[in-house]
Amino acid sequence: AITEAREEAKPYPLFPGPLPGSLQTDHTSLLSLPHTSGYQPALMFSPTQPGRPYTGNVAIPRVTSAGSKLLPPLAFKHTVGHIILSEHKDVKFNCSISVPNIYQDTTISWWKDGKELLGAHHAITQFYPDDEVTAIIASFSITSVQRSDNGSYICKMKINNEEIVSDPIYIEVQGLPHFTKQPESMNVTRNTAFNLTCQAVGPPEPVNIFWVQNSSRVNEQPEKSPSVLTVPGLTEMAVFSCEAHNDKGLTVSKGVQINIKAIPSPPTEVSIHNSTAHSILISWVPGFDGYSPFRNCSVQVKEVDPLSNGSVMIFNTSASPHMYQIKQLQALANYSIGVSCMNEIGWSAVSPWILASTTEGAPSVAPLNVTVFLNESRDNVDIRWMKPLTKRQAGELVGYRISHVWQSAGISKELLEEVGQNNSRAQISVQVHNATCTVRIAAVTKGGVGPFSDPVKIFIPAHGWVDHAPSSTPAPGNADPVLII
């Protein structure tokens, strides 16, 4: 019951076509002309009720004003039911209906897939009045059809609150296959199978898929779209594409590169940002990641010293940021530093090694035998000590720092004094009488201040008391400093 028009280059009989009751044509205008033209459309039969004229959606009009006779039921005339054409061609189709002149203000609207077509569409309605009826032809034209024009078109006419609907006209725009899913670039593990997907649609269907790997056809026999290609594994980079074929021709997808994951390249440009006595801050530029994200990095540190055992310290760190502070190093030492990073495949080679040095450290021991006593004038506290036995790494002694804390009822005050490295004694003025003075001494190098000695306390009496007895740090093993007044 649906007739069909199909675009084709060769001559054809009017209706046979490739499908029963179909029409193949290159014409862009497929008109069901009004009866006055002398063309009588063929009588259509309902597919559901063979042998009975098919009238589609009809309006049964009321009796005429004279009340004598019924008018024939109103219905759109049959037209071509299916138009098949190529993309970018022009098409024109129509609906026609004969309406008794008793009806006024008849308007025809066009609908596509259930939605009214409004605005910028090329719809023209022509009226051919006669004595009793007016033939109305509503034409719809589309220039340079696209796939989006595919669909079912109908005419609607309203008369006396009755809606008359035409048979649908199916527009099928055919063209080259159109990809709905193309293969995507991937990074894969060597010799491990993976899948690629390709999907394309017509019309016309079917769409057949061929896969191409590095210019060689993978499947000489086509697969119907959609197609999933299982690649059995690669040992080196490859480029894949898929070809989609239908009766109109072929479309080739974008080519996608499949990379093989590998260990990363070694980092480059390892550089020193800051050195202290016991730490070095380094940065590096990561190498190529081997098509697999970096997981972490390893900083390798070797002491450059003929006497060292050549062992390597390894510090693991995150791959980002590309920076690491190496700690727990010896002061005033030379180190060779390299960096390696890893991804899921494995570790890179180590970067070129660079040399770095730590600075002088602070002393690691406090001055020894600290002694404190009040001198005769009671205005000074005399402090004496012995130079600590510092290691070479601590650098040269530049002096001492003396901390003296004065405590009396509810008051506490700390003061600091610096003295030169040649001294092993110092005098400080009494700050408060009737108070306790607590003294600690630390050695100082360019690397910093060492640990303070254990505190030594001395009581400073009120004016008039005399006491020459010293206070001193205890001998090793004693629990607390002894205070002698």
């Epitope: 790997q213 590095n214 060689s216 993978v218 026999q221 059995p232 594994g233 040992t235 490859a238």
Partner: antibody, heavy 118, light 106 residues
């Protein structure tokens, strides 16, 4: 279990023709191509070409373009190899083999010995 | 056409041995497939796409290689492994086979 069953041995005179059949079972016949491979007595394997079981289009390698014809009867899932104007040097075992992606011949017929002798 | 050269052409080995067969291509190919053929029988797919074991093939068989050089290794030969082995290339039409390697019991 995929099976390719070939017709029996043939003894032919020079100049005659022979048609070898290969019946496939347990898979969709039109999904995979069918290849033909020749093995002369005591020799290695020679790929003769293949036939697209979907379209019926055959492809022949250069050495097998002249007197060899691949054909199909998809209704009975069978591929055929016809050799015309037989020569003594056509004496060989002819194998059909299912042809999958990447040119893999994953299942083989048992082979058909064609002997050409006067 | 791409020529495939297998070496050695003949190989004598004992049960339990490990043997390697090499297949060299006259130009680079995408994949190499390997087949085993026993006397009076059809070839049987052994390894496809260079390194993938075909269904039912024991894991003592292994394939590797890329470009123009490919190898088939059999670890710990079994009595049923004595046969002729063929390589076959994919990557350039027409597909071609190597001349075969006959593996015999020593």
């Amino acid at each position: 279990q995929v099976q390719l069953v070939q017709s029996g041995s043939e003894l032919k005179k020079p100049g005659a023709s022979v048609k070898v059949s290969c019946k496939a079972s347990s898979y969709t016949f039109t999904t995979y191509g069918m290849s033909w491979v020749r093995q002369a007595p005591g020799q290695g394997l020679e790929w003769m070409g293949w036939i697209n079981t979907y379209s019926g289009v055959p492809s022949y390698t250069d050495d097998f373009k002249a007197r060899f014809v691949f054909s199909l009867d998809t209704s009975v899932s069978t591929a055929y190899l016809q050799i015309s104007s037989l020569k003594a040097e056509d004496t060989a075992v002819y194998y059909c083999a299912r042809y999958t992606n990447y040119g893999v011949f994953d299942y083989w017929g048992q082979g058909t010995l064609v002997t050409v002798s006067s | 056409d791409i020529q495939l050269t297998q070496s050695p052409s003949f190989l004598s080995a004992s049960v339990g041995d490990r043997v390697t067969i090499t297949c060299r291509a006259s130009s680079s190919v995408g994949y190499m497939h390997w087949y085993q053929q026993k006397p009076g029988k059809a070839p049987k797919l052994l390894i496809y796409a260079t390194s993938n074991l075909a269904q039912g093939v024991p894991s003592r068989f292994s394939g590797s290689g890329s470009g123009t050089e490919f190898t088939l290794t059999i670890f710990s030969l079994q009595p049923e492994d004595f046969a002729t082995y063929y390589c076959q290339q994919w990557g350039s039409l027409p597909f071609t086979f190597g001349q075969g390697t006959k593996l015999e019991i020593k």
